[in-house]
Interface confidence: low
């Protein structure tokens, strides 16, 4: 017998054709016997089964021989073995229809696991094999899992479910709720506005949530709250603000945090962690603030930076247009009795200029002029 | 401010047609997704159906699929609820509700409009 | 369909008290889940969404709780306002279905 398959919640057309081009009598019942629906002449009649407002037929069809049976709204408790009674005849066509969900909300976050569920039909025994939109494949049986969720993954997942050498396929949207960076570094000058700034990797109609950017100041002994707020519509509402360094806040999305002055004592790594509503888990962006200062305090010329450098990077001081008078992978250098002209301090990471301060070193009678 | 404002509804036999009309204002409103919501005398509230903003797609309740159809016209903000072979079961006050509160949530109303099936 | 059952279906409350209405969902719908406020004659009036987050203008008294499958709204010193039938509904899944509804009434 020719066997169908066919998707939850679908339609399905079942065909049953006549050797006579005429419309003639003909009925669709199911493996109980139990009519579905027929025809009284030119009018449909329907019988008592389960499928009555779902069921129907194409009458246009009828006076080609063309006697097909409609389920609407597929669900797989209609898996059956449907007969078409037509011209002494009975042809049979077996039904399977299969749902295939995730069984928790399609927006998932970053490292949380997917699971998708195969609702089939009894006595069947489907195979699926699923594509992620970055083209990994998985296979299973009625559940298949996806541990630890990445941004990749976000996107159409393409489900191939296969039955009797017949194949149905199920397209599921998936939403990973991530930031669009992990970890990001902001390198500024002293005295700078800071712009810190935490897209999202993900849009969606209506968003919810509340967030705080932990801090942990190099030159602090301990960690604080900068700033908590909410999300609400993809508005954002400040609730408290530390009074040093007084924090603004961005009211929509992107997330967005200006510090007014960049500051030595501000230098440090944060940490944003924003809770979505409804989801167990949060989302975070390690941020990370680095502060160059260029001085010169009588005969001693230094530049320092503070935050979280790494060890390669090389922190340098020349006078324009000369070769650096020092170079080190520290996060201070100095020069005593600085020659007069415009110095350069330099934080380079192999060669590319991360942050760049300008001092003017006048002759020693006069005071040191920072443009 | 936010207004939504229904009207067509009355008395109408078994069988019969109704089309019912949400007049929206002080939004815009083809950006929100649009619901209907019916109450019974006496009983809580039951979806009936709702449209995108676009109206591309569609969502109905069981009971009433293909006898009801929900549909939406941007360029007039008004969205309706064509209601074909009523049956004494669909007797009913009809809001009109936005989706506009977070979560899905429906967080504007009309005053509802009466509709009542009886021969 | 999701059927949503609410308890009690009525309560019987005085001035000043703490009324709890609780909600369960036949499955788990998330935090995808609203509380209504019904006064008679009116529309209904949305106070929490989200499981248990406050809609603007809604008193802090009105909070929501819960996840998955099971829900609650409370009202921590009831006012002579606060009289009405209260409905929860789930946005998990078509067709959205509300529960049959809560009565707080004075004792």
């Known amino acids: 017998k020719k066997v169908v398959l066919g998707k939850k919640g679908d339609t399905v057309e079942l065909t049953c054709t006549a050797s006579q081009k005429k419309s003639i009598q003909f009925h669709w019942k199911n493996s109980n016997q139990i009519k579905i629906l027929g025809n009284q002449g030119s009018f449909l009649t329907k019988g008592p089964s389960k499928l009555n407002d779902r069921a129907d037929s194409r009458r246009s069809l009828w006076d080609q021989g063309n006697f097909p049976l409609i389920i609407k709204n597929l669900k797989i408790e209609d898996s059956d073995t449907y007969i078409c009674e037509v011209e002494d005849q009975k042809e049979e066509v077996q039904l399977l229809v299969f749902g295939l969900t995730a069984n928790s909300d399609t927006h998932l976050l970053q490292g949380q696991s997917l699971t998708l569920t195969l609702e089939s039909p009894p006595g069947s025994s489907p195979s699926v094999q699923c594509r992620s939109p970055r083209g990994k494949n998985i296979q299973g049986g009625k559940t298949l899992s996806v541990s630890q969720l990445e941004l990749q993954d976000s996107g159409t997942w393409t489900c191939t479910v296969l039955q009797n050498q017949k194949k149905v396929e199920f397209k599921i949207d998936i939403v990973v709720l991530a930031f669009q960076k992990a970890s990001s570094i902001v390198y500024k000058k002293e005295g700078e506005q800071v712009e810190f700034s935490f897209p999202l990797a993900f849009t969606v109609e209506k968003l919810t949530g509340s967030g705080e950017l932990w801090w942990q100041a190099e030159r602090a002994s301990s960690s604080k709250s900068w700033i908590t707020f909410d999300l609400k519509n993809k508005e954002v509402s400040v609730k408290r603000v530390t009074q040093d360094p007084k924090l603004q806040m961005g009211k929509k999305l992107p997330l967005h945090l200006t510090l007014p002055q960049a500051l030595p004592q501000y230098a440090g790594s944060g940490n944003l962690t924003l809770a979505l509503e409804a989801k167990t888990g949060k989302l975070h962006q390690e941020v990370n603030l680095v502060v160059m200062r260029a001085t010169q305090l009588q005969k001693n010329l230094t530049c320092e930076v503070w935050g979280p450098t790494s060890p390669k990077l090389m922190l340098s001081l020349k006078l324009e247009n000369k070769e650096a008078k020092v170079s080190k992978r520290e996060k201070a250098v100095w020069v005593l009795n600085p020659e007069a002209g415009m110095w350069q301090c330099l934080l380079s990471d192999s060669g590319q200029v991360l942050l760049e301060s300008n001092i003017k070193v006048l002759p020693t009678w006069s005071t040191p002029v920072q443009p | 401010e936010v207004q939504l404002v229904e009207s067509g509804g009355g008395l109408v036999q078994p069988g019969g047609s109704l089309r019912l009309s949400c007049v929206a204002s002080?939004?815009?409103?083809?950006?929100?997704?649009m619901s209907w919501v019916r109450q019974a005398p006496g009983k809580g509230l039951e979806w009936v159906a709702n449209?995108?903003?676009?109206?591309?797609?569609?969502y109905y309740v069981d009971s009433v699929k293909g006898r009801f159809t929900i549909c939406r016209d941007n360029a007039k903000n008004s969205l309706y609820l064509q209601m074909n072979s009523l049956r004494a079961e669909d007797t009913a006050v009809y809001y009109c509700?936005?989706?506009?509160?977070?979560?899905?949530?429906?967080?504007?109303w009309g005053q509802g409009t009466l509709v009542t099936v009886s021969s | 369909d999701i059927q949503m059952t609410q308890s009690p279906s009525s309560v019987s409350a005085s001035v000043g008290d703490r009324v709890t209405i609780n909600c369960r969902a036949s499955?788990?719908?998330?935090?995808?889940l609203a509380w209504y406020q019904q006064k008679p004659g009116k529309a209904p009036n949305l106070l929490i969404f989200?499981?248990?987050s406050l809609q603007s203008g809604v008193p802090s008294r009105f909070s929501g709780s819960g996840f998955g499958t099971d829900f609650s709204l409370t009202i921590t010193t009831l006012q002579p306002e606060d009289f009405a039938t209260y409905h929860c509904?789930?946005?998990?899944?078509?067709?959205?279905?509300f529960g049959q509804g809560t009565k707080v009434e004075i004792k």
């Open positions: 002080g939004f815009t409103f083809s950006s929100y997704w």
């Open positions: 449209t995108k903003e676009d109206g591309s797609d569609k």
């Open positions: 499955q788990g719908i998330s935090s995808w």
């Open positions: 509700a936005r989706e506009g509160g977070q979560w899905l949530a429906l967080d504007y």
């Open positions: 989200g499981a248990s």
């Open positions: 509904q789930q946005a998990n899944s078509f067709p959205w279905t």
